[in-house]
């Protein structure tokens, strides 16, 4: 019998290499059975995950999964870092794996490096 626990399917060790000034959508894949849980995003600050308040979020329904989306409009250098989504389910908090945004500022680069190159060249990134 399939579990009806809420699952947040952010991939282990996932990251996104993005450019400051661009729009970006960070997606939290959510699997649930009957009632869609309340989902929130937070940003890691050391060992603490600080809840993101007042941000543009939305839901997207696909065939087998729903996605809780955090919108960056646009991406700022300060958005660099690691994020988690979490869900309230049956009075419990379910947390996702963290996913990392690597942000580079195109103004500081003569041309846009490749996304994979950005992730492997930390001196291009904002801390």
């Amino acid at each position: 019998k399939e579990s009806c626990d809420v699952q947040l399917y952010i991939k282990r060790q996932s990251y996104h290499s993005i450019f400051a000034g661009d729009p970006f959508k960070l997606e939290c894949p959510v699997k649930y059975c009957a009632h869609r849980p309340q989902v929130t995003w937070c940003k890691l600050n050391g060992t603490t995950c600080v809840k993101l308040e007042g941000r543009h979020t939305s839901w997207k329904q696909e065939k087998n999964l729903s996605f809780f989306i955090l919108h960056f409009e646009p991406v700022l250098p300060s958005d660099n870092g690691s994020y988690r989504c979490s869900a309230n389910f049956l009075s419990a908090i379910i947390e996702s794996h963290s996913t990392t945004l690597y942000v580079t500022d195109v103004k500081s680069a003569s041309e846009r490096p490749s996304k994979d190159e950005m992730a492997s060249r930390p001196w291009l990134l904002y801390s």
């Epitope: 991939k11 996104h16 290499s17 894949p29 696909e62 999964l65």
Partner: antibody, heavy 120, light 108 residues
Framework: QVQLQESGPGLVKPSETLSLTCTVS????????WSWIRQPPGTGLEWIGY???????KYNPSLKRRVTISVDTSKNQFSLKLSSVTAADTAVYYC??????????????WGQGTLVTVSS | EIVMTQSPATLSLSPGERATLSCRAS???????LFWYQQKPGQAPRLLIY???TRATGIPARFSGSGSGTDFTLTISSLQPEDFAVYYC?????????FGGGTKVEIK
């Protein structure tokens, strides 16, 4: 039912660039990670790299200097380019989808594979 | 990178027999990071087992996975004619993703 189909030249000359495209049908390329895997004749499987539909990539370090994976969501396709090929790059190349309802990096749908031979 | 070693390279058995395939990782990995695939000649691999022991959709109950740490096992309780194939393990504990060299299960 999701289906993947590889296409591209079956013969590439040494030092040239191998180019393959994977067309996804029966489902959207969006919200998934997509991968290339190869299998030299008579041997095991080697992961080449992945791309997310938004464009983020990760490559096998052993091939990283030569590999580019790109995505075209409007065509429901993603592509592989492998530069400076040698005979050692002769293999069956598979495209595959990374399972969505998972925290991990395993492959639930595969193309049928296309044999690419590197020879002059 | 994590090296996955499979043994034996070839397993010769008769239909109805039990097959036990081994996969060993070069470093300890959690159960959640181990997968098994089946590949028949001229076909792409097919996901059998994820999380070391959970059968993928549509996989018969005669296939089971077990193990932890560095040692994992795929067991086919009673070989059917369609089970004769090559089996691969894969890890995703660390990148790059790596596969074992495969075990060929052939008809004796």
């Amino acid at each position: 039912q999701v289906q993947l189909q590889e296409s591209g030249p079956g013969l590439v000359k040494p030092s040239e660039t191998l180019s393959l495209t994977c067309t996804v049908s029966g489902g959207s390329i969006s919200y998934y990670y997509w991968s290339w895997i190869r299998q030299p004749p008579g041997t095991g499987l080697e992961w080449i790299g992945y791309i997310y539909y938004s464009g983020s990539t990760k490559y096998n370090p052993s091939l990283k200097r030569r590999v580019t994976i790109s995505v075209d969501t409007s065509k429901n396709q993603f592509s592989l380019k492998l530069s400076s090929v040698t005979a050692a790059d002769t293999a069956v190349y598979y495209c595959a989808r990374i399972r969505g309802d998972s925290y991990g990096w395993d492959f639930d749908y595969w193309g049928q594979g296309t044999l690419v031979t590197v020879s002059s | 990178e994590i090296v996955m070693t499979q043994s034996p390279a070839t397993l010769s058995l008769s239909p109805g027999e039990r097959a036990t395939l081994s996969c060993r990782a070069s470093q300890s990995i959690s159960n959640n990071y181990l997968f098994w695939y089946q590949q028949k000649p001229g076909q792409a691999p097919r996901l059998l087992i994820y999380g070391a022991s959970t059968r993928a959709t549509g996989i018969p109950a005669r296939f089971s996975g077990s193990g932890s740490g560095t040692d994992f096992t795929l067991t086919i309780s009673s070989l059917q004619p369609e089970d004769f194939a090559v089996y691969y393990c894969q890890q995703d504990y660390n990148f790059p993703l790596t596969f074992g060299g495969g075990t060929k299960v052939e008809i004796k």
